[in-house]
Interface confidence: low
């Protein structure tokens, strides 16, 4: 492959939180800590900032196979084990064939546990690495184009996802539900809040000509639920309601 090494300014910068971020380790070494009490207070401050980060969206630079850099935003509370699934869904990769490497701003590898929230780690870059089973050079992947989609939910809330416009809503639903923190099995995708007709999950965003939609959690939203549940059942009978194929045990 003939991809240039990106200049530092080419890589998307991680969005810095409004709260004052802790000093990076390289700088704290030279901080004049006058007493043990100050040191404890400083540590407590850093921990507090890290806990604040869990409640914020973290922008990450994601390095895909083929050294292609994309930018994505994840919630700080997302555990590392979910991050792999989330990223692979976003970029059409098989999670069982990839692992994650984390790099800090200083390009040092960051060690993590599967249940560590991403916001607790000062991550600058996430590298999706193919599991090298046979030592062959991975095929460079030109990612399928993604588009920005506005998801409206809970009547007044909005969130943005970047997804493939060619993927069916059935494939996109887990990503949408993850963003809205909804249960996929009890979520309806509608054109807008006023709409009564759930969208056809076999269709893609391009098929439907949509770049904005409404996610309704039928557990929480009482507005015409019984009607919607009937529609859901009807759709389910047609075979395209369930976002996930339930295992036939």
């Amino acid at each position: 492959m003939d991809g240039r090494t990106p200049r530092p300014q080419d890589a998307p910068a991680r969005r810095k939180p409004k709260a004052k971020a802790p000093l990076p380790p390289a700088e704290t070494k030279y901080t004049d800590v006058s007493s043990a009490a100050d040191s404890v207070e400083s540590t407590a401050f850093i921990m507090e900032q890290k806990e604040n980060m869990i409640d914020k969206d973290v922008e990450l630079s994601v390095v895909l196979p083929g050294d292609i850099i994309k930018s994505t935003t994840v919630h700080g509370s997302k555990p590392m084990m979910d991050l792999l699934i989330f990223l692979c869904a976003q970029y059409h990769l098989n999670p069982s064939s990839y692992t994650i490497d984390l790099l800090s701003a200083e390009q040092n590898h960051i060690k993590f546990k599967p249940n560590t929230p991403i916001g607790m780690l000062e991550v600058e870059k996430v590298i999706l690495k193919p599991k090298m089973l046979d030592k062959k050079k991975p095929t460079p992947i030109i990612p399928e184009k993604t588009v920005r989609v506005v998801i409206n939910f809970k009547k007044t809330q909005k969130t943005i996802v970047r997804v493939s416009p060619h993927a069916s809503l059935q494939e996109l639903a887990p990503i949408i539900c993850s963003k809205c923190e909804f249960d996929p099995l009890h979520t309806l995708l509608l054109k807008d809040y006023q709409s009564q007709e759930p969208l056809d999950l076999t269709k893609s965003l391009n098929d439907l000509g949509l770049r904005e939609l409404y996610a309704m959690d039928v557990n929480r939203e009482s507005c015409q639920i019984s009607q919607n549940l009937d529609i859901m059942k009807e759709k389910e009978n047609k075979g395209f309601f369930s976002f996930f194929q339930r295992s036939k045990k």
Epitope: M1, D2, G3, R4, P6, R7, D10, A11, D67, I68, I69, H92, L93, N94, S97, P130, T139, P140, I141, I142, P143, E144, K145, V147
Partner: antibody, heavy 116, light 113 residues
């Protein structure tokens, strides 16, 4: 409406240089990989260069590597192909194309003739 | 590099007939992500190529349903159910599974018998 308009073609002597341009409109330019593809006088299509949507990554076939440079200006919605050390076998119609994993829109092309 | 071979080189047809163009790749075009990145383009006389079919069988927007793509692995086919005058031109297959380089077939000229 997606539009790609190439310009800059012409007659060049072997060993010479030329820069092609492609003006894009009707879509968010910075969202797409862009490509140059050429069509030889025998009507064969050959991919010549590719550039990532942000401009950080460039790709070339061995036949042009080291001689051609693809670049883009996302602020101006322009794609470029700087060609040097031109050879007679570079004679072709040059198209710019948009896409990620297929070329969904092509320009009308600009002709390069390399001859002494 | 993946070599794409198209047959026939030229395909004389009568209007209203069915036409079939074959494309064979030197290696499987099934990507590790499960997709097959095989596409078809049509270049009408005096025009630039236009996308017809992407990922084996998906018609691009505005492409009539008389065009259909099929195949898997290394063997692919483009069918035109009833040839119309506007379908005449050169058809190219192309792959983007193993990239770079992006590679094209040599083309098949659809012409009136």
């Amino acid at each position: 409406e997606v539009q790609l308009v190439e310009s800059g073609g012409g007659l060049v002597k072997p060993g010479g240089s030329l820069k092609l341009s492609c003006a894009a409109s009707g879509f968010t330019f910075s969202d797409y990989y862009m490509y140059w593809v050429r069509q030889t006088p025998e009507k064969r299509l050959e991919w010549v260069a590719a550039i990532s949507n942000g401009g950080s990554y460039t790709y070339y076939p061995d036949s042009v590597k080291g001689r051609f440079t693809i670049s883009r200006d996302n602020a101006k919605n322009n794609l470029y192909l700087q060609m040097s050390s031109l050879k007679s076998e570079d004679t072709a119609m040059y198209y710019c194309a948009r896409g990620d994993y297929y070329f969904d829109y092509w320009g009308q092309g600009t002709t390069l003739t390399v001859s002494s | 590099d993946v070599v794409m071979t198209q047959t026939p080189l030229s395909l004389p047809v009568s209007l209203g007939d069915q036409a079939s163009i074959s494309c064979r790749s030197s290696q499987s075009l099934v990507h590790s992500n499960g997709n097959t990145y095989l596409h078809w383009y049509l270049q009408k006389p005096g025009q630039s190529p236009k996308l017809l079919i992407y990922k084996v069988s998906n018609r691009f927007s505005g492409v009539p349903d008389r065009f259909s793509g099929s195949g898997s692995g290394t063997d692919f086919t483009l069918k035109i159910s009833r040839v119309e005058a506007e379908d005449l031109g050169v058809y190219f297959c192309s792959q983007s599974t193993h990239v770079p380089p992006w590679t094209f077939g040599g083309g098949t000229k659809l012409e009136i018998k």
